[in-house]
Amino acid sequence: MMTGTIETTGNISAEKGGSIILQCHLSSTTAQVTQVNWEQQDQLLAICNADLGWHISPSFKDRVAPGPGLGLTLQSLTVNDTGEYFCIYHTYPDGTYTGRIFLEVLESSVAEHGARFQIP
């Protein structure tokens, strides 16, 4: 039975040209995390595999940096980066947990972080 929950940075906003950290945290489970995928809609951005370490998709290598931790840093943001991002925790023996973050990239200098929220 899946007992864990994923806490994410929730809905966040950032300025065009700046950077942002996408963070998820899996809690309330003793399951072993075997891999974390970071995905944007239908694209695989990066993977952190327990055995193989970090791998960044070639098309994002210039603008995506691993970490901190199991998080992901997006750099040189453009308005096209606005959208949903997913952290997908592959765990053993529980199975798969998914967290969602919505990022809005703003032209203006006003960018505030949204509240944290949980996905069971």
């Epitope: 891999q35 995928n37 695989l44 595999n49 998709s57 023996p93």
Partner: antibody
């Protein structure tokens, strides 16, 4: 449309090798693992191994280690399996199958090729 | 000898429900969540019906459901239809380990 198209049937002599291809289309090839599963006539499914192009990681079932080579060509979105030292019991339909989830952690297989019949006979 | 044990055959009449069991007989394929079920009609490629014990891929009828208790996963088909007659395979795929298939169960619709 997401699909896997396999190469045609092969007839091989014992002791020889066979190489089967699996061309993917309709998705980002490098993001998903591809496994090879075979099925002897009237028998069940048998996982042989798989490749995750994103990591260039290859896993081969213990039974086939030393006899199976699995490769992928990202430029043509094609996966290959080569089986050497063929014997009559290798006669089977060989399927390629795509991981359900991106990243190739070893997974359920949601897209399958139609299969390639390999017959080993003297 | 597979590390997953399935009954060789099951049968049922149209409209009935049938359940196929799949028991892990080794620690590698024990009580984890990575279990799936495939349907295979004669001469066709397998089709994924259930993954991670109880999740249905899009396009699969909600007459198919999966569950697990301990080392045993089960596939239940409700409202049995003639086209459900096929072979069914369970699979175990723990991360970073070999995928294992059960020997298969032949479902006959009477």
């Amino acid at each position: 449309e997401v699909q896997l198209v396999q190469s045609g049937a092969e007839v091989k002599k014992p002791g020889s090798s066979v190489k089967v291809s699996c061309k993917a289309s309709g998705y980002t090839f490098a993001s998903y693992g591809i496994s090879w599963v075979r099925q002897a006539p009237g028998q069940g499914l048998e996982w042989m191994g798989g490749i995750t192009p994103f990591f260039n990681r290859v896993d081969v079932a213990e039974k086939f280690q030393g006899r199976v080579t699995i490769t992928a060509d990202k430029s043509t979105s094609t996966a290959y399996i080569e089986l050497s030292s063929l014997r009559s019991e290798d006669t089977a339909v060989y399927y390629c199958a795509r991981d359900l989830r991106r990243g190739g952690v070893g997974d359920a297989f949601d897209i399958w090729g139609r299969g390639t019949l390999v017959t080993v006979s003297s | 000898q597979s590390a997953l044990t399935q009954p060789r055959s099951v049968s049922g009449s149209p409209g009935q429900s049938v359940t196929i069991s799949c028991t892990g007989t080794s620690p590698d394929v024990g009580s984890h969540a990575y279990r799936s079920w495939y349907q295979q009609h004669p001469g066709k490629a397998p089709k994924l019906m259930i993954y991670e014990v109880s999740y249905r891929p899009s396009g699969v009828s909600n007459r198919f459901s999966g569950s697990k208790s301990g080392n045993t996963a089960s596939l239940t088909i409700s409202g049995l239809q003639a086209e459900d007659e096929a072979d069914y395979y369970c699979s175990s795929y723990p991360p970073s380990s070999a995928t294992v298939f059960g020997a298969g169960t032949k479902l006959t619709v009477l």
